[in-house]
């Protein structure tokens, strides 16, 4: 697997992270990596339509470090990471750079190598098990039997590491095989099957939608109490938590 | 029934190649995997590759640049061929069914032809 | 490649007995093992396959366990029809090894 060149670490205040671009947005605890079919089974114009579906899915998530965190990676039949989870730049870098994500347009494309990328190297260590753990396999060919040796192993090995995958089948030549194997392997597992890439901005809203549903609302924040506020009632003193109460999606 | 018959030459000469026939019946071609199998005379068993229900194929890395396996779905028939074979390739060859299919990650040969002897030999 | 080593390589048991195989991997197989039995002149059969699975239509006096790289078969009771030479066989990593064999005779 390859990693894209390494480019000066943008540091920013997560709390003045830039504002939301949509009504619908989630604010939830969420791991979430996003697998992009580098086959020549999309052409270079229908990945750029998977690029762009990929960027509006990022608009509508509350990216940062402490909310959802993204990865995105192309695979052929190897992998390539274009942003890991700990990668601490802003949303519209993090959204330039999946926008930029090269068309590799490969013979063949490895779901097998890249579930086994994002178990063994993504997901290596669980550093936020308060989050959820999704991967959006983003399907459009079929890898040869012989590279789905391990296929079940690796679904499995992500299930035992509470990795929900949701696969996203495009087009006439996705592997529906495997797509149901995914679906078999966890309730969960939600698949998606669209007919071409045009379908993509259709679904967008319901896979959002259905990702954060599964991601858990981050706890109200607790403070040091020179931090609590003091509220005074009739006859009682009370202490609350600064800040206001933050919705899980607004819709 | 699964049925798998080798059939071949049982005399090669040494530096030739050996071409063997897996004829099958009683299970789809697609569905499942062919292996090879060979076994020196009073020997051990030695896995020599296998071919995919998709075609794809995989190969002992000990004999890979002289081994082809292929498949004639018409026919239902799958063909070994080793080449500059000597007489350390002197074995019993059998061909065996494999559920090579990734629903199933239990790779056992559960079905195996009777097999047959070729001789390396001038 | 992973190497499988069997033992013993033979041994001598009566009609009744209860005999144990030993097969042991040169690096961890997780579960990924199979046994086969062949007799003189006859194809190798499948008797056990993901370490403890019974193929259909074997007796219940064959099991298989263990995990990692440690893996044992057992026969409850031979019958007169178990002598026969037995391998293990691994297929967590191509190329798929088999052990060198363990030939089981009459007393």
């Known amino acids: 697997p390859t990693d894209a060149p390494v480019s000066p670490t943008t540091l920013y205040v997560e709390d003045i992270s830039e504002p939301p671009l949509h009504d619908f947005y989630c604010s939830r605890l969420l791991d979430l990596v996003f697998l992009l079919d580098g086959s020549s089974r999309l052409s270079e114009a229908e990945f750029e339509v998977l690029k762009a579906f990929v960027v509006d899915m990022m608009e509508r998530l509350r990216i940062s470090q402490k909310w959802v965190r993204v990865a995105v990676v192309e695979y052929h039949d190897g992998s390539h990471a274009y942003i890991g989870l700990k990668d601490r730049k802003r949303p519209s870098e993090l959204r330039r750079i999946a926008s930029q994500v090269k068309y590799a347009g490969s013979q063949v494309a490895s779901t097998s190598e890249v579930l086994k990328y994002t178990l063994f190297q993504i997901f290596s260590k669980i550093d936020r098990p308060e989050a959820s753990r999704i991967t959006l396999l983003l399907m459009a060919s079929q890898e040869p039997q012989r590279m789905s040796r391990n296929f079940v192993r690796y679904v499995q090995g992500l299930k035992k590491k509470k990795v929900i995958v949701i696969p996203v089948g495009i087009g006439p030549h996705a592997n529906l095989k495997q797509i149901r194997l995914i679906e078999k392997q966890a309730p969960e597992n939600k698949a998606f099957v669209l007919s071409s890439v045009d379908e993509l901005e259709q679904q967008r809203d319901e896979i959002v939608s259905y990702l954060c549903d599964l991601a858990p609302e981050a706890p109200p924040p607790t403070l040091p109490p020179d931090m609590a506020q003091v509220t005074v009632g009739p006859g009682l003193l009370g202490v609350s938590t600064l800040g206001p109460k933050r919705n899980s999606m607004v819709l | 029934q699964v049925q798998l018959q080798e059939s071949g030459p049982g005399l090669v000469k040494p530096s030739e190649t050996l071409s063997l026939t897996c004829t099958v019946s009683?299970?789809?071609?697609?569905?499942?995997?062919v292996d090879w199998i060979r076994q020196p005379p009073g020997k051990g068993l030695e896995w020599i590759g296998m071919?995919?229900?998709?075609?794809?194929?995989d190969y002992n890395s000990a004999l890979k640049s002289r081994v082809t396996i292929s498949v004639d779905t018409s026919k239902n028939q799958f063909s070994l061929k080793l080449s500059s074979v000597t007489a350390a390739d002197t074995a019993v060859y059998y061909c065996a069914r494999d559920p090579a299919d990734y629903g199933n990650y239990d790779y056992a040969l559960d079905y195996w032809g009777q097999g047959t002897l070729v001789t390396v030999s001038s | 490649d992973i190497q499988m080593t069997q033992s013993p390589s033979s041994l001598s048991a009566s009609v009744g007995d209860r005999v144990t195989i030993t097969c042991s991997a040169s690096q961890d197989i997780n579960k990924y093992l199979n046994w086969y039995q062949q007799k003189p002149g006859k194809a190798p059969k499948l008797l056990i396959y993901y370490t403890s699975s019974l193929h259909s239509g074997v007796p219940s006096r064959f099991s298989g366990s263990g995990s990692g790289t440690d893996f044992t078969l057992t026969i409850s009771s031979l019958q007169p029809e178990d002598f026969a030479t037995y391998y293990c066989q691994q297929y967590e990593k191509l190329p798929w090894t088999f052990g060198q064999g363990t030939k089981v005779e009459i007393k």
């Open positions: 071919i995919w229900g998709d075609g794809s194929t």
């Open positions: 009683g299970f789809s071609l697609t569905d499942y995997g």
